[in-house]
């Protein structure tokens, strides 16, 4: 995370800033949601543990054409140190559970807020 470059940032962004920016974007999504988010698309649930950012990206990257989560996908892509493609799955997914993108975003947001409060930026 220490080398994560933001939209307008000329250089590296501190992990706390990056995490806060992601939280703010997820809050924005949940607050501005009118119609079903991403037309009610379903994604694999993930274990909110180590490797969470890559797992979250691996799940959300399978949602296409959803402008509401494009910035989140970009952020998670910056958080994840390896290349992630659609259809790619890691052991971090709960493969028998699919949830709506809206629920996925809420779950992720709650967990990230907890990490931020505890100072776990990495």
């Amino acid at each position: 995370l220490t080398c994560l470059g933001g939209f307008a940032s000329p250089g590296p962004v501190p992990p706390s800033t990056a995490l806060r920016e992601l939280i703010e974007e997820l809050v924005n999504i949940t607050q501005n949601q009118k119609a079903p988010l991403c037309n009610g698309s379903m994604v694999w649930s993930i274990n909110l543990t180590a490797g969470m950012y890559c797992a979250a990206l691996e799940s959300l990257i399978n949602v296409s054409g959803c402008s509401a989560i494009e910035k989140t996908q970009r952020m998670l892509s910056g958080f994840c140190p390896h290349k992630v493609s659609a259809g790619q799955f890691s052991s971090l997914h709960v493969r028998d559970t699919k949830i709506e993108v809206a629920q996925f975003v809420k779950d992720l947001l709650l967990h990230l807020k907890k990490l931020f409060r505890e100072g776990q930026f990495n």
């Epitope: 470059g5 037309n39 949602v63 296409s64 959803c66 402008s67 996908q73 970009r74 892509s77 910056g78």
Partner: antibody, heavy 118, light 111 residues
Framework: EVQLKESGPGLVAPGGSLSITCTVS????????INWVRQPPGKGLEWLGM???????DYADALKSRLSISKDSSKSQVFLEMTSLRTDDTATYYC????????????WGQGTSVTVSS | DIVLTQSPASLAVSLGQRATISCRAS??????????MHWYQQKAGQPPKLLIY???NLESGVPARFSGSGSRTDFTLTIDPVQAEDAATYYC?????????FGGGTKLEIK
């Protein structure tokens, strides 16, 4: 199999309006975005605008006032409308699908030729 | 809008040699550590075809002689070694911001 096919009027009079339809198959318009791109004879590509799967529409700044993009997902069709046509709007008009993130255009139609002339 | 300037406008390369095409953006196309620059190939009478996405990732089915590099404002498409079927016009395209743009194109001729 993913396919996109444009259909247009061919010839339009200056000052008139243009309507082009992009009919797709092999994927759903509710979860894929469609771009409109044009290419004047012997020239380069120009992005006109796009409609996202969730309905958001983005336009090229220079053409925003003359363009309208819409879709009928149930009929797998996307529509481009352009008003106040000029001779320099003569071009081949393409529709192209965005792939998954990072949303590059991975499938294109063959294009439809539009001539603006009296 | 971000303006993309390609150079050269045209080039002629001998069969088996290296072709290098440059694309310069009027402002950075980097976002959260990724470069939102893509490359397309267009042969005469055909629609464009995606070659490279995110500056350096080869699209599925594209030969390994194509490669991309660069970040922020300066990007390069390299074809090495050039084959006869690579005669085409090549375009860069950015989607770092909502209003997407293409470069002016570079026409590659094979000698």
């Amino acid at each position: 199999e993913v396919q996109l096919k444009e259909s247009g009027p061919g010839l339009v009079a200056p000052g008139g309006s243009l309507s082009i339809t992009c009919t797709v198959s092999g994927f759903s318009l509710t979860d894929s975005s469609i771009n409109w791109v044009r290419q004047p004879p012997g020239k380069g590509l120009e992005w006109l605008g796009m409609i996202w799967g969730d309905g958001r529409i983005d336009y090229a700044d220079a053409l925003k006032s003359r363009l309208s993009i819409s879709k009928d997902s149930s009929k797998s069709q996307v529509f481009l409308e352009m008003t106040s046509l000029r001779t320099d709007d003569t071009a081949t008009y393409y529709c192209a699908r965005d792939g998954y993130f990072p949303y590059a255009m991975d499938f294109w139609g063959q294009g439809t030729s539009v001539t603006v002339s009296s | 809008d971000i303006v993309l300037t390609q150079s050269p406008a045209s080039l002629a390369v001998s069969l088996g040699q290296r072709a290098t095409i440059s694309c310069r953006a009027s402002e950075s196309v980097d976002s959260y550590g990724q470069s939102y620059m893509h490359w397309y190939q267009q042969k005469a009478g055909q629609p464009p075809k995606l070659l490279i996405y995110l500056a350096s990732n080869l699209e599925s089915g594209v030969p390994a002689r194509f490669s991309g590099s660069g970040s922020r404002t300066d990007f390069t498409l390299t074809i090495d070694p050039v084959q006869a079927e690579d005669a085409a016009t090549y375009y860069c395209q950015q989607n770092a911001e909502d209003s997407r743009t293409f470069g002016g194109g570079t026409k590659l001729e094979i000698k």
